[in-house]
C-alpha cells in the first residue's frame, strides 16, 4: 500500500478510510499542482485505471463513486493530465480498507493444564472482520476487585503467578476495531475447578494366550490429582462405533484395563480424564492401535457375550464416529456418548 507519498494536493474518502464492507464509497481527489491546469483527473485502484462513475466537480477536484465496495483492502491514487506533459502527474494516494465490526466473542472457556503454570482461555472470534481487530482479555479478581487486561488473538495464556492474590475471577473478552466493539459474556472462574489433569498416555497393550483371550491395556498419567474420572474408548479400525468405558482412576500406579475383544482384529484405543466432579476434560489421547491374537481352538466368538472390562467401577456404552474415511486418523473422529445403548445416528462432538 501507500504509506508515505508526497502529495501535490489531497485525497479523502467518505465515509472514511476504513468503512463497513458493502457500503457505497466516494473518493475525492483535489489537485494543487504548480504550473498545471489539469485537462483530466484520473483514479487508479491497485494500479489499474478506473473508467466508470467518475465526476469532475470543478477545475481542481474529481470524485469516484463505488457502489457496495466489498474489497478488504485497496490502494487508491489519482493523477492529473497536465498540458504539455507526456506522463500523468501524481496528485495523492490512500490505502482504504473495508470490513466488519467484531462479533461478540463467544464460547469463552478457561482451563489450567496441570503443570503448565498458565490459565489458558479460548473463545470463538466469530466471522472475519478483514480489518485490524484486537482482543483484550479482562481478568478481575472477585476477592480483591483488581483487574488485569491482556492482549490476545483467539486465545491467551496467563501465568498463574499473576493470579496469586485470589482463587475466584471474572473473565471476559473485549473485541475492538475501528468499526465497533463487543464484549463476550462474563465467565466465573474458580482456579481450583478448572484444572485438567496431566496428559493420560496409553503405554502398551497385550493379548493373553488364555482359553478366552483378554487384552490388557496399560496407561498412565503424571497427575498429582487424587480423584480422577476417566473414559477409554475403543473400536476396530474398520468400525464406526466406539465403545466407551468409564471408571475412577488412581494414578499412583499404572492403570490396567482388561478387554474381551474380537480375535485377529486391529483395535484403536484412546483415553481421556478429568478431575472427578469437574467440567473440563483432557483431549483424547493419541490413538493407540493394537492387533489382537488369532483365535485358537474351536471356541466360537460371540461379540454380544462380553465386550466389557473386568473392573468394578465401569460403564460401557457405544458411540458412533462422524466419519468412516481414513480410519488411521482416529484423532479426527468425534462422537456423542449414549450411555448404555448403541448410538442412533446422532453425530455431535464429545471432545
Amino acid at each position: 500500500g501507500i504509506t508515505s507519498i508526497n502529495c501535490s494536493g489531497d485525497m479523502w474518502v467518505e465515509p472514511g478510510e476504513i468503512f463497513q464492507m458493502g457500503m457505497n464509497v466516494s473518493i475525492y481527489c483535489q489537485e494543487a499542482l504548480k504550473h498545471c491546469r489539469p485537462r483530466n483527473l484520473y483514479f487508479y485502484k491497485n494500479g489499474f485505471k478506473e473508467e466508470f462513475d467518475i465526476t469532475r466537480i470543478n477545475r481542481t477536484t474529481a470524485r469516484i463513486w463505488y457502489k457496495g465496495f466489498s474489497e478488504p483492502h485497496a490502494y487508491m491514487h489519482c493523477t492529473a493530465e497536465c498540458p504539455g506533459h507526456f506522463q500523468e502527474t501524481l496528485i495523492c494516494g490512500k490505502d482504504i480498507s473495508s470490513g466488519h465490526p467484531p462479533d461478540a466473542p463467544s464460547n469463552l472457556t478457561c482451563v489450567i493444564y496441570e503443570y503448565s503454570g498458565n490459565m489458558t482461555c479460548t473463545w470463538n472470534t466469530g466471522k472475519p472482520t478483514y480489518i485490524d481487530t484486537k482482543y483484550i482479555v479482562h481478568v478481575k479478581s472477585l476477592e480483591t476487585e483488581e483487574e488485569q487486561q491482556y492482549l490476545a488473538s483467539s486465545y491467551v495464556k496467563i501465568s498463574t503467578d499473576s493470579l496469586q492474590g485470589s482463587r475466584k475471577y471474572l473473565v471476559w473478552v473485549q473485541a475492538v476495531n475501528s468499526l465497533g466493539m463487543e464484549n463476550s459474556q462474563q465467565l466465573h472462574v474458580h482456579l481450583d475447578d478448572i484444572v485438567i489433569p496431566s496428559a493420560s498416555i496409553i503405554s502398551r497393550a497385550e493379548t493373553t494366550n488364555d482359553t478366552v483371550p483378554k487384552t490388557i491395556v496399560y496407561w498412565k498419567s503424571k497427575t498429582m490429582i487424587e480423584k480422577v474420572f476417566c473414559e477409554m474408548r475403543y473400536k476396530t479400525t474398520t468400525n464406526q462405533t466406539w465403545s466407551v468405558k468409564e471408571f475412577d482412576a488412581n494414578f499412583t500406579y499404572v492403570q490396567q484395563s482388561e478387554f474381551y475383544l474380537e480375535p485377529d482384529s486391529k483395535y484403536v484405543f484412546q483415553v481421556r480424564c478429568q478431575e472427578t466432579g469437574k467440567r473440563n476434560w483432557q483431549p483424547w489421547s493419541s490413538p493407540f492401535v493394537h492387533q489382537t491374537s488369532q483365535e485358537t481352538g474351536k471356541r466360537n466368538w460371540q461379540p454380544w457375550s462380553s465386550p466389557f472390562v473386568h473392573q468394578t467401577s465401569q460403564t460401557v456404552s457405544q458411540v458412533t464416529a462422524k466419519s468412516s474415511h481414513e480410519p488411521q486418523k482416529m484423532e479426527m473422529l468425534s462422537a456423542t456418548i449414549f450411555r448404555g445403548h448403541p448410538a442412533s445416528g446422532n453425530h455431535q462432538d464429545i471432545g
Epitope: 483484550i136 487486561q149 492482549l151 490476545a152 495464556k157 475492538v176
Partner: nanobody
Framework: QVQLQESGGGSVQAGGSLRLSCAAS????????MGWFRQAPGKEREGVAT????????FYGDSVKGRFTISRDNFKNTLYLQMNSLKVEDTAMYYC????????????????????WGQGTQVTVSS
C-alpha cells in the same frame, strides 16, 4: 523513530484537576498502543491508562478508574490524560508511552511492554 513529549504537569490541591498532553511525532503509518504511566518516589512504574488507536476502547488501572480519562486527537497526534478528583497518592512523575505492536499475551498496562517513552512531567497533589 517515535518521539513523545509530555506537558501539563504541575501542583494542585487534592480534589482538583489537571490535563496532561503528549505530543507524538515520527510515526509510521498504522495503529499504535499508547498510554500513560506513572512513577512515585521509591515505587515501581505503574500503568495508569492505555488505548489502541485502531478502536474506541480505553483501559484503566484500578486506582484511577472513574477519575481519569484518556483520549487522543488524531489530527494533532496528541494523547491526553484528564485527571479529576486528584488525591495525594496520585503524586508522581507521569510518562507517555507508545508501541506499534504489543506482543500477544502482553498485560497492556505493564510498562515493560512499551517501546517508546517520553521524558515525563511531574504531578504534585497536596492536601
Amino acid at each position: 523513530q517515535v518521539q513523545l513529549q509530555e506537558s501539563g504537569g504541575g501542583s494542585v490541591q487534592a480534589g482538583g484537576s489537571l490535563r496532561l498532553s503528549c505530543a507524538a511525532s515520527g510515526y509510521t503509518s498504522g495503529n499504535y498502543w499508547m498510554g500513560w504511566f506513572r512513577q512515585a518516589p521509591g515505587k515501581e512504574r505503574e500503568g495508569v491508562a492505555t488505548l489502541w488507536t485502531g478502536g474506541a476502547s480505553t483501559f484503566y488501572g484500578d486506582s484511577v478508574k472513574g477519575r481519569f480519562t484518556i483520549s487522543r486527537d488524531n489530527f494533532k497526534n496528541t494523547l491526553y490524560l484528564q485527571m479529576n478528583s486528584l488525591k495525594v497518592e496520585d503524586t508522581a512523575m507521569y510518562y507517555c508511552a507508545a508501541d506499534p505492536a504489543l506482543r500477544l499475551g502482553a498485560n497492556i498496562l505493564r510498562p515493560a511492554e512499551y517501546k517508546y517513552w517520553g521524558q515525563g512531567t511531574q504531578v504534585t497533589v497536596s492536601s
